[in-house]
């Protein structure tokens, strides 16, 4: 997260880190005791999932292996549409005040809505500085019409933009797949943006979760 702040401890109990060994690979969001939602571009063969701590590499955090993941069947490595994936944990999470599932959206929030994005991604760009603490940034949803002025045809119908006018605050390397939460519901998953990160008036681009609720529910049901 560029130009963000340290999240209030315990305020993001649904935030997970997808690790490759002990190294951060992507963010993710707990949606069920067996399931984590993340970006399709975060796919790996297997994952170590850290839950229940704001500190990356915390020894006291829950760590659960995941060997199965399900990309949206329409994910395109060319256009990056449908950049969403479910990761099935090998064993269920122990729910607590520190580990909770996020609320999936009932509706799509409108432009102008205030949201928070979080992650352990680099706080500087292009040179990287990875924080140990979970970082947050407060951003507002931007209309597709406004966002297309920046990204033109790169912006797909199920992509969502968020940012703050004239501000550098944005997501960056390592934040991928992490949550954009608006009014206590999951509205976005970090997908992409311009580089170096934090260029004012270049919004962050997210997968618009409200458009995928049916796919999420059906996929979890199918692979129970």
């Amino acid at each position: 997260i560029i130009d963000g702040y340290k999240c209030k401890e315990g305020s993001h109990p649904w935030q997970v880190a997808l690790l490759k060994g002990n190294q951060l690979h992507c963010g993710g969001v707990l949606v069920d005791k067996y399931w984590v939602l993340t970006a399709a571009h975060c796919k790996m063969g297997q994952y170590q999932v850290q839950l229940g701590s704001d500190k990356i590499g915390d020894q006291s955090a829950q760590k659960i292996k995941a060997t199965k993941s399900f990309r949206h069947p329409g994910y395109s490595t060319k256009t990056h549409v449908n950049d969403i994936m479910l990761v099935r944990l090998d064993e269920p999470v122990k729910m607590s005040s520190k580990v909770e599932a996020v609320q999936l959206p009932e509706h799509c929030e409108p432009p102008g809505t205030s949201c928070t994005v979080s992650g352990w991604g680099t706080t500087t760009s292009p040179d990287v500085t990875f924080p140990s603490d979970l970082m947050c940034s407060d951003v507002k949803l931007i209309s597709s019409r406004e966002c297309k002025k920046v990204y033109k045809d790169l912006l797909g119908k199920t992509m969502l933009c968020a940012g703050i006018p004239d501000s550098k605050t944005n997501t960056c390397n390592g934040d991928s797949g992490g949550p954009l939460v608006c009014n206590d519901t999951l509205q976005g998953l970090v997908s992409w943006g311009t580089y170096p990160c934090g260029q004012p008036n270049d919004p962050g681009v997210y997968t618009q979760v409200c458009k995928y609720k049916r796919w999420v529910m059906e996929t979890m049901k199918t692979h129970r």
């Epitope: 490759k20 190294q23 690979h25 970006a39 399709a40 571009h41 975060c42 796919k43 790996m44 490595t77 060319k78 990056h80 950049d83 991604g121 760009s125 292009p126 990204y151 033109k152 045809d153 790169l154 997501t171 960056c172 390397n173 390592g174 934040d175 991928s176 970090v190 997908s191 992409w192 943006g193 311009t194 580089y195 990160c197 681009v205």
Partner: antibody, heavy 122, light 108 residues
């Protein structure tokens, strides 16, 4: 230091295969994609394809589809490009390059290997 | 696929000259165009990304401009070490990534 180091020059006969390696160091290999670009003698640059080091997702240039395979070995931070059924017009310098960006999209090549000369001759 | 056309294909110039190279895309690529410098026997080196942003460590005599389909690389005062071949590429509609044909800058 941040670098990509490629394997040495190769001389191959028409119809044979070649496998070029590209070892990354100084950065997190699995967080970036590796692209391959070639340059025939006295000619311009030609994009061949790319691979995501973490997912193994590949995209190949249409004209090379079926002849080229890109792979990675994350344990050694090495990318490989294999080209089969070699022809004389495959004679070129082959470069690996890192694409800079984050998340699903990348925007430019900020790091290149030194190049590997592949000569196809009978 | 988007075609990138560079012009001129070669030019002769003297040290201290102002040099301009153009790159035209077959359709709009917004500002997702980059410029590279390549010297004989060496790998290309990034000069400009996003049409106008100077890569770290590149001298300020290099500048880029343009958006949509027409782009320009300018060297404000040519130095001896600038004699090389210059390429543009587009990262807008990818894959494939497409390069311009190159412009060779030679000593007059």
């Amino acid at each position: 230091q941040v670098q990509l180091v490629q394997s040495g020059a190769e001389v191959k006969k028409p119809g044979a295969s070649v496998k070029v390696s590209c070892k990354a160091s100084g950065y997190t290999f699995t967080s970036e994609g590796i692209h391959w670009v070639r340059q025939a003698p006295g000619q311009g640059l030609e994009w061949m394809g790319s691979i995501s080091a973490s997912s193994g997702d590949t995209n190949y240039a249409q004209e090379l589809q079926g002849r080229v395979t890109m792979t990675t070995d994350t344990s050694t931070s090495t990318a490989y490009m294999e080209l089969r059924s070699l022809r004389s017009d495959d004679t070129a310098v082959y470069y690996c390059a890192r694409a800079a960006g984050y998340g699903a999209r990348h925007w430019y090549f900020d790091l290149w290997g030194q190049g590997t000369m592949v000569t196809v001759s009978s | 696929d988007i075609q990138m056309t560079q012009s001129p294909s070669s030019l002769s110039a003297s040290v201290g000259d102002r040099v301009t190279i153009t790159c035209r895309a077959s359709q709009s690529i917004s500002s997702y165009l980059n410029w590279y410098q390549q010297k004989p026997g060496k790998a290309p080196k990034l000069l400009i990304y996003g049409a106008s942003s100077l890569q770290s460590g590149v001298p300020s005599r290099f500048s880029g401009s343009g958006s949509g389909t027409d782009f320009t690389l300018t060297i404000s005062s040519l130095q001896p070490e600038d004699f090389a071949t210059y390429y543009c590429d587009q990262f807008y509609s990818t894959p494939p990534i497409t390069f311009g044909g190159g412009t060779k800058v030679e000593i007059k």
